[in-house]
């Protein structure tokens, strides 16, 4: 069965995939596609790295982690509800029948509908509300659009909510790394 | 044009080998993964043996593992089967097919290998 | 292995005839279906890929359907060049198998 991730409507969706190089730099190729794992290579493929760098990528689809490292997780940005659904990772190790392949499960919930703020118009023009989390790579910001009213203790309780749910993505995923030599 | 095109069939005796080639021409070999299929005489198909692009991962079905070795030479645009102690049930049609989208969409017109004594 | 089963394993019809060809895996294989033509002498044409996708030049009187384990191949007017040995494949488990083959002849 997949392992489920989840994200909202308009946000980025990270799929996590790794495995550890053999050497600094010494690649493996491996591909993503939308849809179960096939039998070779990936259905539909939205993104190939090779031995080297990305040799091909599809709008909207890429790599936010250090792929040289083999952090080969997928960032999907402005996620939409078409984008729900399985997704291929498969980590081509050199070999005779060596292919690692993960199928992860994408879901997409509605963005949550709030009602438009009524005071303070001002503060929220100029500040938009976005709070950054820690990511694999560069910072991932997520904005939370139109809130209601916010105080600064809620903003570092949504803050704290926000890193506590990545970290708790961060120590699911970490047994899905794959050693190679 | 888009074409595959086998050669190196014949007649083999049990135990010996034979080598196949395909060559591909009008498009980009190094992209895509092969394979070989092969058809007994009045039968169905069968999947052998496939290779990715680089021709670093090899793929083998268990009736050949050990036995067959694919290979590729992306310089010459070139798919190989290196077939060892060849058996009669070997007996076939042997097809090179360029995998694409999970799809066999591009096959040559295939090499005869009769193994008998 | 996954095994594919065709049935029927032959079929009569005539020009201008719709006919159905299905196909049953022996566990889900995710809509990677393929089905391909095959003619005497000749190698295997791609006709269906993924279940319902047609690839570029294969007529549209060819259609493909199904999900999970069953599968269909239809042809709505058989043309004379449509009699041959008809082949699905599945392309989700290692091996990737194919199908006994459907002949479909002229009645």
């Known amino acids: 069965s997949e392992v489920e991730y989840r994200a909202e409507v308009g946000q980025n969706a990270y799929l996590p995939c790794f495995y550890t190089p053999a050497a600094p730099g010494n690649l493996v190729p491996v591909c993503w596609g939308k849809g179960a794992c096939p039998v070779f290579e990936c259905g539909n493929v939205v993104l190939r790295t090779d031995e080297r760098d990305v040799n091909y990528w599809t709008s909207r689809y890429w790599l936010n982690g250090d792929f040289r490292k083999g952090d080969v997780s997928l960032t999907i940005e402005n996620v939409t509800l078409a984008d729900s659904g399985i997704y291929c990772c498969r980590i081509q190790i050199p070999g005779i029948m060596n292919d690692e392949k993960f199928n992860l499960k994408l879901v997409i919930k509605p963005a949550k509908v709030t009602p438009a703020p009524t005071r303070q118009r001002d503060f929220t023009a100029a500040f938009p509300r976005m709070l950054t989390t820690r990511g694999h790579g560069p910072a991932e910001t997520q904005t939370l659009g139109s809130l209601p009213d916010i105080n600064l203790t809620q903003i570092s309780t949504l803050a704290n909510e926000l890193r506590d749910s990545r970290l708790a993505n961060d120590l699911r995923d970490s047994g899905a790394t794959i050693r190679i030599g | 044009e888009v074409q595959l095109l086998e050669s190196g069939g014949g007649l083999v005796q049990p135990g010996g080998s034979l080598r196949l080639s395909c060559a591909a021409s009008g498009f980009s070999f190094s992209s895509f993964y092969f394979s070989w299929v092969r058809q007994a005489p009045g039968k169905g198909l069968e999947w052998v043996s496939a290779i990715s692009g680089n021709g670093r991962s090899t793929y083998y079905a268990d009736s050949v593992k050990g036995r067959f070795t694919i290979s590729r030479d992306n310089s010459k645009n070139t798919l190989y089967l290196q077939m060892n102690s060849l058996r009669a049930e070997d007996t076939a049609v042997y097809y090179c097919?360029?995998?694409?989208?999970?799809?066999?969409?591009?096959w040559g017109q295939g090499t005869l290998v009769t193994v008998s004594s | 292995d996954i095994v594919m089963t065709q049935s029927p394993s032959s079929l009569s019809a005539s020009v201008g005839d719709g006919v159905t060809i299905t196909c049953q895996a022996s566990?889900?294989?995710?809509?990677?279906l393929n089905w391909y033509q095959q003619k005497p002498g000749k190698a295997p044409k791609l006709l269906i890929y993924a279940a319902s996708s047609l690839p570029i030049g294969v007529p549209s009187r060819f259609s493909g359907s199904g999900s999970g384990t069953d599968f269909t191949l239809t042809i709505s007017s058989l043309q004379p060049e449509d009699f041959a040995t008809y082949y699905c494949?599945?392309?989700?488990?290692?091996?990737?198998?194919f199908g006994q083959g459907t002949k479909l002849e002229i009645k």
């Open positions: 494949q599945q392309a989700y488990g290692f091996p990737p198998t």
């Open positions: 566990e889900a294989i995710y809509g990677y």
């Open positions: 097919a360029r995998y694409y989208n999970t799809g066999f969409d591009l």
